[in-house]
Interface confidence: low
């Protein structure tokens, strides 16, 4: 599966859940940057 990065968390989604399901370090970095930038 492939996650597109986005600027907001889905319902019940957390950085931890993303971390647990992300398939690569690259994907984690993409998520992290956009989530932090949206705060």
């Amino acid at each position: 599966k492939h996650k597109c990065f986005r600027k907001e968390l889905e319902e019940n989604e957390t950085l931890e859940s993303i971390m647990n399901t992300a398939e690569s370090e690259e994907e984690l970095k993409k998520y992290f940057y956009y989530l932090e930038g949206s705060k």
């Epitope: 931890e16 971390m19 370090e25 984690l28 970095k29 940057y33």
Partner: antibody, heavy 122, light 113 residues
């Protein structure tokens, strides 16, 4: 105030075990990833291990994988490093360090403990 | 693993003068999708733990004097102290957090000339 207070260092024989502790205060401990970083006497910094805010995800340097275990008790605001099968080359000051963020990423450290000396010698 | 190499190993600078420390990574720490460099700088004084100065290669940590600045991208980075003060005598380390294991440079000792 915001701080990390370390304990548990000391002298241990090669092959022995030791547990380091790092008590956090002044911030919501469970919200942040934590790491251990060590510094051999007169040498540079070496990252050892990291753990996510929930404790579900752990990461290790190759030099300690299988011998060291990082853990945390968020109810006690405390980080641990269990060190087994210690070697002379593990002799160092061990620092606990706080990541500014809750996941493993991005991996830099904005708050450090004062360090605790671990000496492995017979 | 990504290797970090600093230069010089030590430097002596007169008070009020500029100090420049270089850091080179063995592979790029620039993540193209967000155009961020995964690099931090720390200051360590004798008998003390390291102190975060700069992250994302150029973002100054809160409370750090503006005489400290970071620059560079990809594999080549620089920490600049624009006007050296006596309290800046320390060892400075770069660190990459692009991938685990996180790795540090060997350190650069800054002294007063």
């Amino acid at each position: 105030q915001v701080q990390l207070v370390q304990s548990g260092g000391g002298l241990v024989q090669p092959g022995g075990s030791l547990r380091l502790s790092c008590a956090a205060s002044g911030f919501t401990f469970s919200n942040y990833a934590m790491s251990w970083v060590r510094q051999a006497p007169g040498k540079g910094l070496e990252w050892v291990s990291a753990i996510s805010g929930s404790g579900d995800n752990t990461y290790y340097a190759d030099s300690v994988r299988g011998r060291f275990t990082i853990s945390r008790d968020n109810s006690k605001n405390t980080l641990y490093l269990q060190m087994n099968s210690l070697r002379a080359e593990d002799t160092a000051i061990y620092y606990c360090a706080k990541d500014p963020h809750s996941s493993r990423w991005p991996g830099f450290f904005d708050l450090w403990g004062r360090g605790t000396l671990v000496t492995v010698s017979s | 693993d990504i290797q970090m190499t600093q230069s010089p190993d030590s430097l002596a600078v007169s008070l009020g003068e500029r100090a420049t420390i270089n850091c080179k990574s063995s592979q790029s720490v620039l993540y193209s999708s967000n155009n961020q460099n995964y690099l931090a700088w720390y200051q360590q004084k004798p008998g003390q733990p390291p102190k975060l100065l700069i992250y994302w290669a150029s973002t100054r940590e809160s409370g750090v004097p503006d005489r400290f600045s970071g620059s560079g991208s990809g594999t080549d980075f620089t920490l600049t102290i624009s006007s050296l003060q006596a309290e800046d005598v320390a060892v400075y380390y770069c660190q990459q957090y692009y991938s685990t294991p996180y790795t540090f440079g060997q350190g650069t000792k800054v002294e007063i000339k």
